[in-house]
């Protein structure tokens, strides 16, 4: 099952997702998709990345993080009903069908018409790389099978390691990472 | 206007080893997915291998794996099929084709090449 | 691996009818599905793709839905040039796959 992430509408979404280069600037290409992980690259694509730089990206679509260390978590700004569904982040690893592929389900709610209450807003005060998610972890947690036998370190997910927002602080540590080299 | 010409097929014995190539023009060659793909005479589609823009990540079927490599030079935008211990199984015509962008179909293929394993 | 079983194997119909084409899989594709129309000699070409979008230059009497395991390819009015073998193809697990193929002749 896909991990569940949450935002509401008008709010921006976030979906994390991250790789660790084998030396600064030896980026791997990264593709992010609207829809399931295909066999190939990534449906629907949104956001791509090669070797160097960003190459592909549409409206609203963008990385907030430092893509040049592997933090290719995706941002989508002012989030409708419509962009609920299941988002494709592939990381395609040199080699011999190496690529990993994370699917992560995002769900929309209605805006609220309360304020978000104090704890919430603590929260993202307390840790301004989440501004964008409310705070929201994932709902569900999501094994993932064992890597190609290569120099990786076993993938670590956000919704292993991320229990609920109290966990927040490892989030750069404990997201959908994959360490290469 | 896209076009993808396939070459190198030919015959040769079981055990032999032939290299095809997959000239292609009409669209950015370093940007897209291709794979090749074979036809047995008389026989549906079969998906061979698979390599991305950069040629970082290639992906093969389990009845090439270990004897074909797929490998590009983007720099003459070509696609090539490296094939080692060829079986009578392997008679085929080859075609490449180019991703559609999202990596879920094929939407420009060439016209094939045909190899032929006999002794 | 994922099964692609299309049926019938071969159609027989005449031009200006309705030719109704299958493709079942093994296990859910998603929306992963293409087709593709084969004529003797030549290479396969591109007619629907991610289920139900026709491609670039496709006439509108091609239509193809379903979505999961059940897959229809739909030609409204066959056209002389219709008469073809069409393959379905998914590319949702791995490894990608092929139908078998559904012929579709002259009666």
């Known amino acids: 099952s896909e991990v569940e992430y949450r935002a509401e509408v008008g709010q921006n979404a976030y979906l994390p997702c991250f790789y660790t280069p084998a030396a600064p600037g030896n980026l791997v290409p990264v593709c992010w998709g609207k829809g399931a992980c295909p066999v190939f690259e990534c449906g629907n694509v949104v956001l791509r990345t090669d070797e160097r730089d960003v190459n592909y990206w549409t409206s609203r679509y963008w990385l907030n993080g430092d893509f040049r260390k592997g933090d290719v978590s995706l941002t989508i700004e002012n989030v409708t009903l419509a962009d609920s569904g299941i988002y494709c982040c592939r990381i395609q690893i040199p080699g011999i069908m190496n690529d990993e592929k994370f699917n992560l389900k995002l769900v929309i709610k209605p805006a609220k018409v309360t304020p978000a209450p104090t704890r919430q807003r603590d929260f993202t005060a307390a840790f301004p790389r989440m501004l964008t998610t409310r705070g929201h972890g994932p709902a569900e947690t999501q094994t993932l099978g064992s890597l190609p036998d290569i120099n990786l370190t076993q993938i670590s997910t956000l919704a292993n390691e991320l229990r609920d927002s109290r966990l927040a602080n490892d989030l750069r540590d404990s997201g959908a990472t994959i360490r290469i080299g | 206007e896209v076009q993808l010409l396939e070459s190198g097929g030919g015959l040769v014995q079981p055990g032999g080893s032939l290299r095809l190539s997959c000239a292609a023009s009409?669209?950015?060659?370093?940007?897209?997915?291709i794979s090749w793909v074979r036809q047995a005479p008389g026989k549906g589609l079969e998906w061979v291998a698979a390599?991305?823009?950069?040629?970082?990540?290639?992906y093969y079927a389990d009845s090439v794996k270990g004897r074909f490599i797929i490998s590009r030079d983007n720099s003459k935008n070509t696609l090539f099929l490296q094939m080692n211990s060829l079986r009578a199984e392997d008679t085929a015509v080859y075609y490449c084709?180019?991703?559609?962008?999202?990596?879920?179909?094929?939407?420009?293929w060439g016209q094939g090449t045909l190899v032929t394993v006999s002794s | 691996e994922t099964v692609l079983t299309q049926s019938p194997v071969t159609l027989s119909l005449s031009p200006g009818e309705r030719a109704t084409l299958s493709c079942r899989a093994s296990?859910?594709?998603?929306?992963?599905l293409a087709w593709y129309q084969q004529k003797p000699g030549q290479a396969p070409r591109l007619l629907i793709y991610?289920?139900?979008n026709r491609a670039t230059g496709i006439p509108a009497r091609f239509s193809g839905s379903g979505s999961g395991t059940d897959f229809t390819l739909t030609i409204s009015s066959l056209e002389p040039e219709d008469f073809a073998v069409y393959y379905c193809?998914?590319?949702?697990?791995?490894?990608?796959?092929f139908g078998q193929g559904t012929k579709v002749e002259i009666k």
């Open positions: 084709a180019k991703d559609g962008g999202s990596g879920s179909y094929d939407d420009f």
């Open positions: 009409g669209f950015t060659f370093r940007t897209h997915l």
């Open positions: 390599i991305t823009g950069s040629g970082g990540s290639t």
């Open positions: 296990q859910s594709v998603g929306s992963y």
């Open positions: 991610d289920a139900s």
């Open positions: 193809q998914q590319r949702s697990n791995w490894p990608p796959t």
